[in-house]
């Protein structure tokens, strides 16, 4: 291999340009991250298989050995060489696949040696004739365009034995005869041929690695040599199918070329992208320059590898030169593993498709160019549910979409690889990348389709990507009451006032004696004033910040273990509910209204008082009766002020905390659920008639879509984190004053099992009457949508008895910490509460997004109008009776996600001019302008009713 | 502190009627039902029933259904169990008790009120 | 109805000495229980609900067990002030129900 240096180096093609463009494409741009639109008209759509890895027959009808068929028994560890998915035999149910599929193109490969066993062309074996003459007619039958590669690296065994293979240049005219009969026989029915498929990895593995046949390795110079013959095959054969056969056939004719990708280190430096232009050249460049570029090797190649590698005369340049009638492009896994499959250069692989087929246009020229061959692989125990090869040609296909459309590269058809599981070469059968399923112990070798053969049917017939989810943007307004929020988690009181300067009456000088101390000034009394509620250095700040933000409402959460140390009434910390009271009454006069949480557990800090965290907190049902006394202490002191409450902030995600077993979570809920109830009835019947605000809990309310929606078992799970999720606590609320029955039922069935040895608590009559109806609206704390999958789970574990597993959709955007932006998802979580619970009132308490911006927070301020948007669209169009939207949150944590509006040290981030513009607009006014707020609308009689209150 | 004092000791005929009171302080009163408790001479407690404070709907056993009743006077923070057409097995003392919504048992109870019958 | 059955109606024990009350349910109460003491004409008085968790103000030599049917009162070192009668309680369903008592008496 060739020396790392880092001298600058000039390349014919302009492809290192491509990472010196912006590589911070806007993180909101969602047409970056995943682009909704279709392909060019007439798109070419196909997808492909090798004969090698699918024939099978492998001795059958006079087929001659291959190389392949010697290195599996010599080289290869493989149980059977009769696995495979025998298309030689099951050629019908190919068929029934591709049909399945909808596609416009088949590319498979003739295996030379099935037509001619010893490699010679003489007399074709009759029985391989006869089956590529009936797969060509029955797909020419079916309007499926064939796309024929006549070498995908099973060489005559013959050939290898005789000559060597392809180090020697005798098979360069031996390869020509064989595609000359290939034309002649079959370039009637054939448009589009290939004449070798991945050259690269023939030269690189089957000589240099040993990986792949023949298995020889450690000869560099071989690895050149055979690169070279392999092109000047292909050359003789463009210049034969051009000169003999394109006048009348009309056909096309390329070669594959494979490649990896790679992306710098650094983005800026230059080192780093020369590096990366030197690996992408050493294996695309090696064959692509000769025949897409200046008929030469890269000019990098050249210099360092002097010694092994074979020099083009100046007639063979102009020989290779242009030999490729469009540019066939592989980008696969055979391309990226083993790791020595490419010099990385100390760079850092990347499967970015839309990046490569960029560099291909700028380095070549933008050419035309197929994707003979993309696709991922799955492990081989994966069956018909392959979720992650989804999301991966999803990836792919929508990276292909956005070169086409954002970039102009021109990417004229798709092939996806593959169409069946079959021999993955030194992988053997240990891995598959069928869009069909093959149980290869079967008899039939039935093709059951996977998950991403629904998935590329679906493309395929849409040409493209449809939004289905999401409906258009909105214009319109909130009604005028509408809160407009932001939430903050515990607000921890200041103890004393900060602020001393008021209440001492002494006079003092500075540094008098010149020890920088303060002397008091004897005789001197200065008049003092009462504490005012400004001198709390906190609540200025809140002011101040709650102030640039123009909200109308502010959630915070009350410290339990402050204002009660004990736990109970014993001991009231005065001075927090003095804090507090300053927190309400400094806002109300910025006509900033409170929503107090009474209780805001953490992670890493239940909140408790002390004592009753020893006792045993939420595990002990008399915890109830302590937050019972506390809820009434704050209804007390603050009830007057506040008219929106929350007892518990996510209940639901109290199994973070509690988690030893199933069971403790379980009680843990159950006497949060009771104590919440408690409080309800306390507030209801005691401070309600008084005070007339209105009371709820709110619950973590992410939505759940089927990780794959292919698989009846991934919608179950979906509707099973709901359950498990909200409804768990929505249910007895809202409905029918126990637990779901679908949650119930499935722990208990899970017990049965022996799966688990969980027990959902059962409520008893009194707590069933206590807790039905306990909650005054819907409080949801709605952040994302999570892809979720069925996976059976052991063990007593509330995360273990849901059985659900979590997917990552690679194509949504998404935030430093994963969270997907994905707002309808919150629309279809406020439909599904009103369906499930009914018409009540909802307010969003808790919306938000971490961003790692400081100041311009571009994906928070994409979040809020996108959720905000959805938000609206469930008012206008659902009817739904949303009545606050709080964003979150005030401020960040240090070293935590960063979710803030402002920093840990207050600094303002600009997603706070955007929240200013929603709330001042209350919405999304259309031009000329909704009705405002502040003016009267319609009722001349509201005047006097505001008098009279 | 929470107290719930109950009427005097009543000696009473059969056939006639006793109401026992049971007045509360301490407490919002309207906020926690009120239970009746029966202790015959020497037996073990029997719960008879209990009353809404805050919709006057009250609930009773089979045993004490008909001339049994249960009443509130909540602007006095005042439940009331009244007894008709006394029989000789109706003596025993009467318990009120505040409850915690049916959750935790009986935390406070009052002192208790004899009930005599007899010819 | 549930019927709250309390094994043994009199227990003569000495002072000092570790007591163990039992009540049992005929169904399952899932810890919906309350141990009550009284003592001669006073009214009962709540010592623990839920099974196990003692009621403020009640010494720490009482104690709850117990789940399903099962359940068990205990005071590990009788006192004086602890002589009385003993009732547990279901508050699981309608109707409430109580068990006999089970009187402690000095021996």
């Known amino acids: 291999d060739y020396k790392d240096d880092d001298d600058k180096l000039d390349f014919p093609g302009d492809g290192r340009a491509v990472w010196s463009q912006n590589p911070n494409l806007s993180p909101v741009n969602e047409s970056q991250l995943f682009l909704y639109d279709t392909f060019p008209k007439n798109f070419f759509w196909g997808v492909g298989t090798g004969a090698f890895q699918v024939e099978g027959s492998w001795k059958k009808d006079g087929k001659g050995l291959s190389v392949w068929d010697h290195f599996i028994a010599t080289h290869l560890n493989v149980s059977s060489r009769d696995g495979s998915s025998d298309s030689y035999i099951f050629l019908e149910k190919d068929l029934s696949a591709l049909d399945f599929l909808g596609v416009s193109f088949y590319q498979f490969s003739i295996s030379w040696p099935r037509l001619f066993p010893d490699g010679t062309v003489a007399v074709a074996n009759a029985k391989g004739l006869q089956y590529y003459n009936r797969l060509l007619d029955s797909l020419l039958l079916r309007n499926i365009e064939p796309v024929v590669t006549l070498y995908h690296w099973d060489l005559p065994w013959a050939l290898q034995e005789k000559y060597g293979g392809w180090k020697n240049e005798t098979l360069i005219d031996l390869f020509n005869d064989y595609a000359t009969y290939c034309f002649q026989t079959f370039g009637d029915r054939v448009k589009y041929w290939i004449t070798i498929h991945n050259p690269y990895l023939v030269a690189w593995h089957g000589y240099g690695t040993g990986l792949h046949a023949p298995g020889e390795k450690g000869n560099v110079a071989a690895v050149y040599t055979v690169g070279h013959n392999l092109l000047k095959a292909h050359s003789k054969v463009w210049h034969n199918y051009n000169r003999n056969f394109r006048p009348h056939q009309k056909g096309w004719l390329s070669i594959t070329l494979g490649s990896h990708w790679i992306e710098p280190n650094r983005a800026e430096s230059i080192v780093d992208i020369l590096k990366c232009q030197q690996s992408m050249v050493s294996v695309l460049g090696w064959f692509a320059n000769p025949i897409h570029g200046d008929g030469d090797y890269p000019e990098v190649m050249t210099k360092k590898l002097l010694s092994v590698l074979p020099a083009f005369s100046e007639a063979e340049k102009n020989e290779v030169r242009g030999t490729a009638d469009f540019f066939a492009f592989s980008f696969g896994p055979n391309n990226f593993k083993p790791l020595n499959t490419m010099a990385k250069m100390g760079q850092n692989v990347s499967l970015n498709l839309r990046q490569v087929l960029n560099w291909i246009k700028l380095e070549y020229g933008n050419p035309r160019i197929l994707i003979a061959e993309n696709g991922w692989f799955t492990d081989s125990y994966v069956q018909t549910e392959d979720t992650t090869a989804i999301y991966m040609m999803k990836n792919f296909l929508n990276q292909v979409l956005q070169a086409i459309r954002l970039d102009g590269v021109r990417v004229f058809g798709y092939t996806a690889w593959s169409l069946l599981d079959g021999f993955e070469w030194q992988d053997a059968y240990n891995t598959r990348r069928g869009l069909f399923y093959v149980d290869f112990n079967s008899e039939q070798r039935e093709r059951r389709p996977k998950s991403s053969a629904h998935y590329y049917k679906q493309v395929i017939g849409e040409n493209g990507f449809t939004l289905r989810e999401a409906t258009p943007d909105l214009q319109g307004q909130f009604p005028c009451d509408f809160s407009w929020g932001v939430t903050e988690s515990v607000l921890k009181p200041e103890s004393v006032a900060s602020s001393p300067q008021f209440s001492d009456p002494h006079l003092y000088v500075w540094n008098a004696t010149g020890n920088r101390m303060l002397h008091r000034v004897e005789g001197v009394r200065l008049k003092t004033r009462p504490a005012q509620c400004t001198d709390f250095i906190t609540i200025k700040k809140q002011l101040e910040m709650l102030a640039r933000m123009k909200v109308t409402h502010f959630r915070f959460a009350l410290d339990w273990a402050s204002v009660l140390p004990t736990g109970n009434l014993s001991e009231v910390n005065r001075q927090a509910l003095r804090y507090y009271r300053c927190v309400v009454t400094e806002g109300l006069k910025l006509n900033i209204s409170p929503m107090v949480t009474l209780y805001y557990p953490t992670h890493a800090h239940l909140g408790l008082p002390a004592p009753l965290l020893h006792s045993g907190g939420w595990l002990d049902p008399s915890t109830a009766k302590a937050f019972r006394d506390y809820a009434g202490l704050c209804f007390r002191e603050l009830g007057d002020l506040v008219k929106l409450w929350i007892t518990i902030n996510e209940p639901n995600r109290l199994s973070d905390v509690y988690n030893r077993t199933s069971n403790d979570t379980y009680q843990a809920a159950h006497n949060l659920l009771i104590a919440h109830a408690i409080v309800w009835h306390l507030y209801d019947r005691q401070y309600r008639p008084s005070q007339r605000g209105a009371l709820s809990l709110s619950l973590h309310s992410d939505w759940a879509e089927p990780a794959n929606p292919y698989v009846a078992s991934h919608w179950q799970a979906a509707e099973r984190f709901l359950q498990f999720e909200i409804a768990w606590f929505a249910e007895p609320l809202f409905k029918t004053g126990d637990y779901p029955v679908a949650m119930r039922e499935y722990i208990a069935s899970k017990t049965r099992r022996g799966l688990s040895s969980s027990v959902l608590p059962r409520f008893s009559d009194a707590e069933r009457r206590l807790v039905k109806g306990a909650a005054d609206f819907y409080a949801l704390n709605h952040f994302t949508t999570r892809f979720v999958m069925h996976e059976q789970q052991n063990g007593s574990r509330y995360d273990s008895d849901r059985d659900v597993q979590f997917l990552q959709d690679i194509t949504r955007l998404a935030s430093p910490s994963r969270l997907a932006v994905m707002p309808w998802g919150e629309g279809k979580l406020l439909r599904w509460m009103r369906n499930n619970y009914g018409d009540l009132d909802v307010y969003i308490t808790a919306n938000g997004i971490d961003d790692q911006a400081l100041q311009n927070d571009q994906l928070r301020q994409y979040y809020l109008e996108k959720y905000v948007q959805e938000a609206l669209k469930a008012y206008l169009i659902d009817k739904i009776k949303i009545k606050g939207y709080y964003a979150f949150k005030l401020t960040e944590e240090k070293s935590k996600p960063r979710f803030g509006f402002f920093t840990s040290d207050f600094k303002a981030k600009s997603s706070i001019q955007f929240y200013n513009k929603l709330i001042t607009s209350n919405g999304f006014p259309s031009e000329n302008g909704g009705p405002r707020c502040n003016q009267t609308q319609g009722n001349p009689e509201c005047t006097v009713c505001l008098l009279l209150l | 502190q929470i107290q719930l004092v109950q009427s005097g000791p009543e000696l009473k005929k059969p056939g006639e009627t006793a109401k026992i009171s049971c007045k509360a302080s301490g407490y919002a009163f309207s906020n926690y039902g009120m239970n009746w408790v029966k202790q015959a001479p020497g037996k073990d407690l029997k719960w008879m029933g209990w009353i809404d404070t805050d919709t006057g709907e009250a609930t009773y056993t089979d045993d004490f259904k008909g001339r049994f009743v249960f009443s509130l006077e909540t602007s006095a923070s005042t439940a009331y169990l009244q007894i008709n057409n006394l029989k000789n097995e109706d003596m025993a003392t009467y318990f009120c008790?505040?409850?915690?919504?049916?959750?935790?048992?009986?935390?406070?109870w009052g002192h208790g009120t004899l009930v005599t019958v007899s010819a | 109805d549930i019927q709250m059955t309390q094994s043994s109606s009199s227990f003569s024990v000495s002072l000092g000495d570790r007591v163990t009350i039992t009540c049992k349910a005929s169904e399952d109460i899932y810890n919906r229980l309350a141990w009550y003491q009284q003592k001669p004409g006073s009214a009962p008085r709540l010592l623990i609900s839920a099974a196990t968790s003692l009621e403020t103000g009640v010494p720490s030599r009482f104690s709850g067990s117990g789940s399903g049917k099962d359940y068990t009162l205990s005071i590990t070192s009788l006192q004086t002030e602890d002589v009385a009668t003993y009732y547990c309680?279901?508050?699981?369903?309608?109707?409430?129900?109580f068990g006999a008592g089970t009187k402690l008496e000095i021996k």
């Open positions: 008790a505040r409850e915690e919504y049916g959750l935790f048992g009986f935390p406070y």
């Open positions: 309680q279901q508050y699981w369903s309608n109707p409430l129900t």
